[in-house]
Interface confidence: medium
């Protein structure tokens, strides 16, 4: 009679996380007498997965009734698979011995790979705001996926971006992987309502990619434009000068009026007008008593926006 | 048969405080017979972490069932890790002996480092107030973090500050560290509504820094400006003189009127007008009966603000 062979027909098996994995094994003979065990890995550090005769293995069930006479099928099913279960599984035949049973023959091994979904991508933007025409960086991260093959794309308002760099870690074999990508985005004045999107495609997602988003409103500062004009007034001894502060973002704005370089009034913008592109406008006016001045007056509208250095615009008021 | 080896596969393991640490250890043989123990540190002062056979180690669980026949995996998991658990852990095999078991072989050791979050930064300002144009110091403290690498930044109203000095203690190795930083801030008249922010970034914070704040309103004193003017009155024998006290902070203010150097009336400011910059204005008036005076009267408005030395402004009232 030919010597017993241990047949593991599949070289590899791929299972989605949470599902059960069936690992097949068959013997070609009933002799010699002795138990079958399943191990993950080989050598001294191998991990016992199932022992036919003793032990407690609640996640493992046998496909056949191992105790049936003439049974040669020693396939097992492992429930609730996680990425940590990945590895090579060996079906091993032992021969009864004293004091211990002796390993007789091992199967060739079946590599179990676990398909695990990537986590929802998290997109984060720059720590400080930047102004239009400048470039800012956004990062996208996702973890816990397997296998390693994955595709990441960046979009700005639906338009695909090309200036980005992506890493998948670790470089070697692992039970699961992480992806990290950094995209460089050039800001424009109209970007207050813009969005960047990080899109991840993976075999586990059945063609339905995961997306993470970030709003450019958190990353942009649009500095205001100033215009100072004199408005007509009925009263002869009064002049009304307005300062139109236009197209700024975010809201925070403090305006100071100076008469010949001396502070006349300071106010904080509150009731703003929002433009369609998400920027704001605001207007302030100053009533000047012309009787109080002999000579011409230089009126300056000075604006501090979002904690930045102040900008100003001046207007020469002629005293006739 | 080869002599037993004790395998500790990881040279180092890093764990976040509060999590569990898995320390892996495997034997290459079942012989000699004797228990396995885990220690922290080496030499005479080493600390017993786990004894396979006896003792009470509620934080330690074994990864495998140590009593299973042929078990060679003596990995352990230590729950609820704190910075005090940092150190090098050794898996040690003993050989049964009399009267005591004898140490047979030790693993190479696994260094456990603990990542611990810094405490919420506490920002404290100067003990006494200072006036605009002066420099005040703010301190920021945070404790209990590990590893030692940490970044601290100061901001005033969103603008990064550069004049500060930071120390991380202790200088040598420790289970956890503290940071102490002192920033020097130049006060301006508009700083009543200003804030200083101490921002701490650490590997444990996943890019979401901790912030501590202090209001400059606690540190600043803006001294008042005084203006004394005479208001027109219908009654011929009465003069109304007002003292306009402007742009002061904090509230505490006592005003005294003097007529030719003699105290006429003292009052404490109560109903104040708050300016947009957070400073206060207040006005006091004095009705002077001109009939009671033969000669011109010098009226003095004397103001004691926030416990400081009094300032005054005088006005000569002409008695026609």
């Amino acid at each position: 009679e030919d010597e017993l062979q241990v047949i593991q027909p599949e070289k590899s098996v791929s299972v989605a996380a949470g599902e059960s994995a069936t690992l097949r094994c068959a013997m070609t003979s009933l002799i010699p007498v002795g138990p079958i065990m399943w191990f993950r890995g080989a050598g001294a550090g191998r991990e016992l997965i199932y022992n036919q005769k003793e032990g407690h293995f609640p996640r493992v069930t046998t496909v056949s009734e191992l105790t049936k006479r003439n049974n040669l099928d020693f396939s097992i099913s492992i429930s609730n698979i996680t990425p940590a279960d990945a590895g090579t599984y060996y079906c091993v035949k032992f021969r009864k011995g004293s004091p211990d049973d002796v390993e007789f023959k091992s199967g060739a091994g079946t590599e179990l790979s676990v398909r695990a979904k990537p986590s929802a991508p998290v997109v984060s933007g720059p720590a400080v705001r930047a102004t239009p025409e400048h470039t800012v960086s956004f990062t996208c991260e996702s973890h816990g996926f397997s296998p390693r093959d994955i595709t990441l794309k960046w979009f700005k308002n639906g338009n695909e971006l090309s200036d980005f760099q992506t890493n998948v870690d670790p470089a070697g074999d692992s039970v699961s992987y992480s992806i990290h990508s950094t995209a460089r985005v050039v800001l424009t004045r109209g970007d207050v309502h813009s969005q960047v999107i990080c899109e991840i495609a993976h075999i586990t997602l059945q063609g339905d990619p995961l997306r993470g988003t970030a709003n450019l409103s958190e990353a942009i500062r649009v500095p205001p434009t100033l215009e100072v004009t004199q408005q007509p007034m009925r009263a002869e001894n009064q002049a009304n000068v307005t300062c139109q502060v236009s197209n700024f973002y975010p809201r925070g704005l403090q305006l100071t009026w100076l008469e010949n370089g001396n502070v006349s009034r300071t106010e904080t913008a509150s009731t703003l007008i929002e433009n369609k592109d998400g920027t704001y406008n605001w207007m302030s006016w100053l009533l000047v008593n012309t009787c109080a001045h002999r000579d011409d007056v230089v009126l300056t509208c000075q604006v501090e926006h979002d904690g930045q250095q102040a900008v100003s615009k001046s207007y020469a008021l002629e005293i006739s | 048969e080869d002599e037993l080896q004790v395998i500790q596969p990881e040279k180092s393991v890093s764990v976040a405080a509060g999590e569990s640490a898995t320390l892996r250890c495997a034997m290459t043989s079942l012989i000699p017979v004797g228990p396995i123990m885990w220690f922290r540190g080496a030499g005479a002062g080493r600390e017993l972490i786990y004894n396979q056979k006896e003792g009470h180690f509620p934080r330690v669980t074994t990864v495998s069932e140590l009593t299973k026949r042929n078990n060679l995996d003596f990995s352990i998991s230590i729950s609820n890790i704190t910075p005090a658990d940092a150190g090098t852990y050794y898996c040690v095999k003993f050989r049964k002996g009399s009267p005591d078991d004898v140490e047979f072989k030790s693993g190479a050791g696994t260094e456990l480092s603990v990542r611990a979050k810094p405490s919420a930064p506490v920002v404290s300002g100067p003990a006494v107030r200072a006036t605009p144009e002066h420099t005040v110091s703010f301190t920021c403290e945070s404790h209990g973090f590990s590893p030692r690498d940490i970044t601290l930044k100061w901001f005033k109203n969103g603008n990064e500050l550069s004049d500060f000095q930071t120390n991380v203690d202790p200088a040598g190795d420790s289970v956890s560290y503290s940071i102490h930083s002192t920033a020097r801030v130049v006060l301006t008249r508009g700083d009543v509504h200003s804030q200083v922010i101490c921002e701490i970034a650490h590997i444990t914070l996943q890019g979401d820094p901790l912030r501590g704040t202090a209001n400059l309103s606690e540190a600043i004193r803006v001294p008042p400006t005084l203006e004394v003017t005479q208001q027109p009155m219908r009654a011929e024998n009465q003069a109304n003189v007002t003292c306009q006290v402007s742009n002061f902070y904090p509230r505490g203010l006592q005003l005294t009127w003097l007529e030719n150097g003699n105290v006429s009336r003292t009052e404490t400011a109560s109903t104040l007008i708050e300016n947009k910059d957070g400073t206060y204005n207040w006005m006091s008036w004095l009705l002077v009966n001109t009939c009671a005076h033969r000669d011109d009267v010098v009226l003095t408005c004397q103001v004691e603000h926030d416990g400081q030395q009094a300032v005054s402004k005088s006005y000569a009232l002409e008695i026609s």
Epitope: - | V33, G45, L48, I49, E54, G55, H56, F57, T67, P99
Partner: antibody, heavy 113, light 108 residues
């Protein structure tokens, strides 16, 4: 739940032998050392010895060496302590304990002629 | 063998007071191997403190343990009526294992 249940009180004559049992539940006796401790009336605790039920290896305190035998039956999850050549000063409560953490309720042995 | 000497033999205190119980070893004991037990009349000893300073499950926080080398201490910050009992220190650093002779904590 871990439980150690000891056999009942014994009265013995000087020179006799007593064998006390300690049946455990909630764990496998092979997993831990089993200790025995003596407490004479109004006195403190005294360690007698221990067994490793996995391979029946024992350790004894010099004071009890030669008179005490500790055994274990892994099939019934029970440990035993046998003390021979009893004398009046052996009158005491005897405790079994699992790995120093869990104790039996104690067995009173009275040696009296 | 390592001899453990406990002091005082008897400690008479009132509820609310602080109690300090000492255990001195004739040679050095690693802190991992020093345990304390509480025993009340007619009951088996209960593990109270393990590895010098760790409270066993369910033991109130008013108890604490400290020490190293040859000198170990059990402290009760503010005595409660149920704390009055006998306390034993125990070493299992080397054979033969030994107990201290006990400290009886009684109500004054």
């Amino acid at each position: 739940e871990v439980q150690l249940v000891q056999s009942g009180a014994e009265v013995k004559k000087p020179g006799a032998t007593v064998k006390i049992s300690c049946k455990v539940s909630g764990f496998n006796i092979k997993d831990y050392y089993m200790h025995w401790v003596q407490q004479a009336p109004g006195k403190g605790l005294e360690w007698i010895g221990r067994i490793d039920p996995e391979d029946a290896e024992t350790k004894y305190a010099p004071k009890f060496q030669g008179r005490v035998t500790i055994t274990a039956d892994t099939s019934t999850n029970t440990a035993y302590m046998e003390l021979s050549s009893l004398r009046s000063e052996d009158t005491a409560v005897y405790y079994c304990d699992r790995g120093l953490a869990y104790w039996g309720q104690g067995t009173l042995v009275t040696v009296s002629s | 063998e390592i001899v453990l000497t406990q002091s005082p033999a008897t400690l008479s205190l009132s509820p609310g007071e602080r109690a300090t119980l000492s255990c001195s070893a004739s040679s050095s004991v690693s802190s991992s191997y020093l345990y304390w037990y509480q025993q009340k009349p007619g009951q088996a000893p209960k593990l109270w403190i393990y590895s010098t300073s760790n409270l066993a499950s369910g033991i109130p926080a008013r108890f604490s343990g400290s020490g190293s080398g040859t000198d170990f201490t059990l402290t009760i910050s503010s005595l409660e009526p149920e704390d009055f009992a006998v306390y034993y220190c125990h070493q299992w650093s080397s054979y033969p294992y030994t107990f201290g002779q006990g400290t009886k904590l009684e109500i004054k």
